[in-house]
């Protein structure tokens, strides 16, 4: 009975650890997309609705704020789309990116950790054009380090939850 | 404020060609395009093409394709529009147009017209 | 290639009537249309853009509604000045238009 209860309680123990373990899921506000053709930052993510989902990690001026030291799964998925009702593009030559970035407060300082994309030829006389950026990575971050998104050509971005999303997941305390 | 003043009323033979300007002020011409749109006697508004002032970028209607060459001096905030080998039918009043969307900004040519030129009347008449 | 069909062709109305110009397009264009005032000899003027944002300027009796593949311009009271011609559009392709009267 005694291994009983200790079994439990190292559930319970484990259960509790993992429902602690701090995750996001934040999806593109498509109310708030800024335009431009170059590098902007997107500050605008739901946190707490449809897909979107935060727990104990915090979303504030646009960026993803980290509460607990740790090594996080860090990931974004960006969509770019074009279809001939919206009009006709200016360029047919885009450069279509995504910038993951980290910006430390303590030590004022940002850093690229990850980069995707490519160079796009879409053509006029296409009804229709497409192209997903998927990027992820292993990162050990510290407590009140921030993670924002910058892409191109942001009045381009797919602006559903299941197109333009980022999040991040702690997998194990830093030894 | 934002004007778009064109060059005055053209007599052509069938056969000729026709150049028609549009001197832009008001605003900075290349962050925009410029569209040239006519309305022939009686007809509906009909588009013929575009061109990004910025980059010389344009795009045309199929049915001009050929006949029609569009083309932006930037220091003198002009775009120019030339259509060759006139006939009758082509008789109608061009004007040109500022798409509302900065293509710098937006990459989009969206089509909502803001600002218009006063039209310049193209009579093709043997 | 899309084709938009306004009706009616013509009407007259009185000063202060409301006043309703339908626009179809041949498939769904989401929102993406607009109409426009044409005068005799004088620019056209954009009125209504992306089917109900009144543009800069325009007099608030004007307004737009609809989305896909229908749409409406409304003036809520027909003045003197609103004897014009109205087109609408989306992207190259215009309404063939609808010209307003005074009874």
């Known amino acids: 009975e005694k291994a009983m209860v200790d079994g439990s309680w190292l559930d319970l123990a484990k259960r509790s650890k993992l429902e602690a373990q701090p995750f996001a899921h934040l999806t593109i506000n498509a109310t708030d997309i800024p335009s431009g053709s170059h590098k902007v930052s997107l500050s605008s993510w739901y946190h707490d609705r449809g897909w979107a989902k935060i727990s104990n990690m915090t979303f504030s001026n646009g960026k993803l704020i980290v509460n607990q030291d740790g090594f996080y799964y860090l990931y974004a998925n960006i969509c770019f789309r074009h279809h001939e009702t919206s009009g006709d593009l200016a360029t047919e030559y885009l450069q279509l990116m995504v910038y993951v970035t980290k910006t430390s407060i303590k030590i004022p300082s940002s850093h690229t950790l990850m980069k995707g994309g490519s160079t796009k030829y879409w053509s006029g006389n296409s009804e229709f054009h497409f192209y997903s950026i998927n990027v992820g990575g292993f990162f050990k971050l510290r407590s009140g380090e921030e993670i924002s998104i910058e892409v191109s050509n942001p009045s381009l971005l797919d602006p559903d939850q299941d197109a333009t999303y980022f999040g991040a997941f702690k997998v194990r305390d830093i030894d | 404020q934002v004007q778009l003043v064109q060059s005055g009323a053209e007599v052509r033979k069938p056969g000729a060609s026709v150049k028609v300007s549009c001197k832009a002020s008001?605003?900075?011409?290349?962050?925009?395009?410029i569209h040239w749109v006519r309305q022939a006697p009686g007809q509906r508004l009909e588009w013929m093409g575009w061109i990004n002032a910025g980059n010389g970028n344009t795009k045309f209607s199929q049915k001009f394709q050929g006949r029609i060459t569009v083309t932006r001096d930037t220091a003198a905030s002009t775009a120019y529009m030339e259509l060759r080998s006139l006939r009758s039918e082509d008789t109608a009043v061009y004007y040109c147009?500022?798409?509302?969307?900065?293509?710098?900004?937006?990459?989009?040519?969206?089509?909502?017209?803001?600002?218009w030129g006063q039209g310049t009347l193209v009579t093709v008449s043997s | 290639e899309i084709v938009m069909t306004q009706s009616p062709s013509s009407l007259s109305a009185s000063v202060g009537d409301r006043v309703t110009i339908t626009c179809r397009a041949s498939?769904?264009?989401?929102?993406?249309l607009n109409w426009y005032q044409l005068k005799p000899g004088k620019a056209p003027r954009l009125l209504i853009y992306g089917a109900s944002s009144l543009q800069s300027g325009v007099p608030s009796r004007f307004s737009g509604s609809g989305s896909g593949a229908e749409f409406t311009l409304t003036i809520s009271s027909l003045q003197p000045e609103d004897i014009a011609t109205y087109y609408c559009q989306h992207t190259r392709a215009f309404g063939q238009g609808t010209k307003v009267e005074i009874k």
């Open positions: 498939q769904s264009i989401s929102r993406y």
């Open positions: 008001g605003y900075d011409f290349s962050n925009y395009a």
């Open positions: 147009a500022r798409d509302s969307s900065n293509a710098v900004r937006g990459i989009i040519i969206a089509y909502y017209f803001d600002y």
